[in-house]
């Protein structure tokens, strides 16, 4: 009644290990770490066999097969490289996830290294089995923006890719009689969100009620350079239109809004987000130079509001940009208080432009981003949104452009985008 001697499988062992096995003796076959028992094409942790009355074993000895983590999961906006030769995916093999640079960056500077574990899953020391996250890089155009020492009077043609966050927002409000069409600018904050001025997305009503235009009436163009050629641009419809709840049509306080795009846009050399600033009530420091781009600044004799309400016919063909200094708040307040009419420059606004006037004080599209280069993070940060200007012709002496102070709204923006600030740390100016 003695059963034949047993040979443990390669990379495996038999317990108990005895010189002889007799009727009713049982042995457990198991495998080394990183291997699985394979019997009749079925993987298991252990396999038990028994010495039978007739001196034979109840089953053949199974084999030990190395654990295979199989093909790793795809990473959105990322790539996978295999550290092991022949692209092995078996136990102790290593892979490395990386993000599509320079447009995406890995959250929390994770190494992206994953090892095939004994359990057959790809594991990272920090994230465990969770995949890393590739977040859009912000404020780093593929073309370097011009140095800010030389002053530019009036608009200058922007090269493609110079303002990759620039969005053209076209609103066609078919609920109005007669139908209304107007445009504005915005700034890409992530693959799915555009920051703009609330008055661009407010229905052009016959009263001062703040009601947003229907999302169906909004089209956003990204990666656009020349409005006559939209073929290379990405156009997207809106999934949501969010106006700041306290936006006031009478004084344009809280003139800020967001558009969520129907689908995330693919990032590339001509489509990249701008960075949001830190939450700080002071806003940009006086005399700092910023850049604003737009399609509506080619005509110095119309006001921003006239441009916004006159439809796309006042569009400049090619994206223009100007360089403007931030004006001390007190100086701007005084310049508007001296005018007839109710012009209040609130703490949610700042001014930019030149005392002596010139085209540069009348920037084209409402909602466009006033960006300042942050030396610390080496990124472009959206500090302002084109909001309003004085009643005189654009570029009049001592009529500064007024911008929404974005730094007062950082928390509101993150809240609307549904992202805790900690998750999007790379997006924040440091």
């Amino acid at each position: 009644n003695e059963c034949p001697e047993l040979q443990p499988p390669v990379h495996g062992k038999i317990e108990p290990s005895q010189a002889k096995y007799f009727f009713k003796d049982q042995v457990l076959v198991s495998c080394d770490t990183g291997y699985k028992v394979l019997k009749d094409n079925v993987e298991m942790d252990t396999f038990q066999i028994e010495c039978l009355k007739d001196g034979t074993w109840s089953n053949k000895i199974p084999t030990c097969k190395i654990v295979d983590c199989r093909a790793p999961g795809e990473l959105e906006h990322g790539l996978i490289t295999f550290s092991t030769r022949n692209n092995l995916t078996t136990y102790k093999s290593e892979i490395k996830y990386s993000c599509q640079e320079p447009y995406y960056k890995m959250l929390n500077n994770n190494t992206g290294i994953y090892t095939c574990s004994a359990q057959g899953v790809w594991m990272n020391k920090v994230l465990g089995r969770s995949l890393p996250t590739c977040l859009p890089e912000c404020g780093q155009p593929s073309r370097s923006l011009p140095s800010l020492v030389k002053r530019i009077i009036g608009g200058r043609n922007a090269e493609p890719g110079l303002f990759p966050w620039q969005a053209l927002i076209v609103v066609e409000d078919t609920s109005r009689v007669p139908n209304d069409k107007w445009f504005g600018s915005g700034a890409l904050l992530s693959a799915s969100w555009i920051l703009t001025a609330a008055h661009v997305l407010r229905s052009q009503r016959r009263d001062t009620t703040v009601i947003p235009v229907s999302k169906e009436h909004v089209t956003v163009y990204l990666g656009l350079h020349d409005v006559r050629d939209k073929s290379g641009a990405v156009n997207s419809s809106a999934a949501r239109v969010v106006l700041h709840p306290d936006f006031n049509i009478q004084n344009y306080n809280h003139d800020i809004a967001l558009v969520q795009l129907q689908e995330p846009v693919p990032l590339g050399p001509h489509v990249m987000p701008v960075c949001l600033p830190r939450l700080e009530p002071e806003g940009p420091a006086p005399h700092m130079l910023g850049l604003v781009a737009g399609w509506g600044i080619s005509n110095p004799n119309v006001t921003v509001d006239e441009i916004i309400s006159s439809g796309t016919r006042t569009l400049s063909d090619v994206l223009q940009y100007v360089k403007l200094p931030v004006v001390p708040h007190a100086e701007c307040k005084t310049s508007y208080e001296s005018r007839s009419g109710n012009y209040s420059v609130t703490e949610n606004m700042f001014c930019a432009g030149y005392y002596e006037g010139g085209k540069d004080t009348c920037l084209g599209d409402s909602g466009g981003a006033f960006v300042i280069f942050d030396d610390l993070s080496q990124r472009w940060v959206v500090q302002g949104l084109v909001s309003w200007g004085g009643p005189e012709e654009c570029g009049s002496k001592q009529v500064y452009g007024v911008y929404t102070k974005v730094s007062n709204y950082v928390d509101w923006v993150w809240e609307q985008m549904g992202l805790p600030q900690s998750v999007v740390e790379p997006q924040v100016e440091r």
């Epitope: 009263d207 344009y252 109710n342």
Partner: antibody
């Protein structure tokens, strides 16, 4: 085409309540607010309040804050105005309007009489 | 609250003549940001709801005859019917929409 159809005339006793309806058709109900206006016999127009169906926001004339309650049912594209604690001076024609007063209902006469 | 005062209360004009109605608001209806005056004019005939004629003080509503025109800014506004027709006999109201809504008391226009 756009239409606002209001419910029929009502006769109520003082102290009672009445609910007037305004059914909208021919446009997207949630894209615009509904206004309510009243006109007492031989008198001028008085704005009561408005409601925005997309988010149920309401605004009232202070005079009608405790008198009128505005609601909407977006499933049936209908706006409602409920008037409470009726008095004889609430006797009037009540109008609803939409698309910024481009379209009006035909009016509902509410008569309050003991 | 903004108070709207119309003048005159009633007006009798010969057919084909000009009719002018004034409306004064207790505060400016000009919004400096949009550069619009939030004032509208309505026409109401007996047994009918009001009809919008003019908005933003001077913009004619679609389908309104061009004999109706609006003018003014700030606190003083005018509705002009350049050549009165028989079908223009009605009560005319101004309405501010700068801060909620307030109607004027109305001006009755009749044929002389």
């Amino acid at each position: 085409q756009v239409q606002l159809v209001q419910s029929g005339a009502e006769v109520k006793k003082p102290g009672a309540s009445v609910k007037v309806s305004c059914k909208a058709s021919g446009y997207t109900f949630t894209t615009d607010d509904i206004n309510w206006v009243r006109q007492a016999p031989g008198q001028g127009l008085e704005w009561i309040g408005w409601i925005y169906p997309r988010d149920d926001r309401t605004k009232y004339n202070d005079k009608f804050k405790d008198k009128a309650t505005l609601t909407v049912d977006t499933s049936s594209n209908t706006a409602y105005m409920e008037l409470s604690s009726l008095r004889s001076e609430d006797t009037a024609v009540y109008y609803c309007s939409s698309l910024e007063d481009t379209y009006w209902g035909q009016g509902t006469l509410v008569t309050v009489s003991s | 609250d903004i108070v709207m005062t119309q003048s005159p209360d009633s007006l009798a004009v010969s057919l084909g003549e000009r009719a002018t109605i004034n409306c004064k608001s207790s505060q400016s209806l000009l919004a400096s940001r949009t550069r619009k005056n939030y004032l509208a004019w309505y026409q109401q005939k007996p047994g009918q709801p009001p009809k919008l004629l003019i908005y933003w003080a001077s913009t004619r509503e679609s389908g309104v005859p061009d004999r109706f025109s609006g003018s003014g800014s700030g606190t003083d506004f005018t509705l002009t019917i350049s050549s009165l027709q028989a079908e223009d006999v009605a009560v005319y109201y101004c309405k501010q929409s700068y801060n909620l809504y307030t109607f004027g008391q109305g001006t009755k226009v009749e044929i002389k």
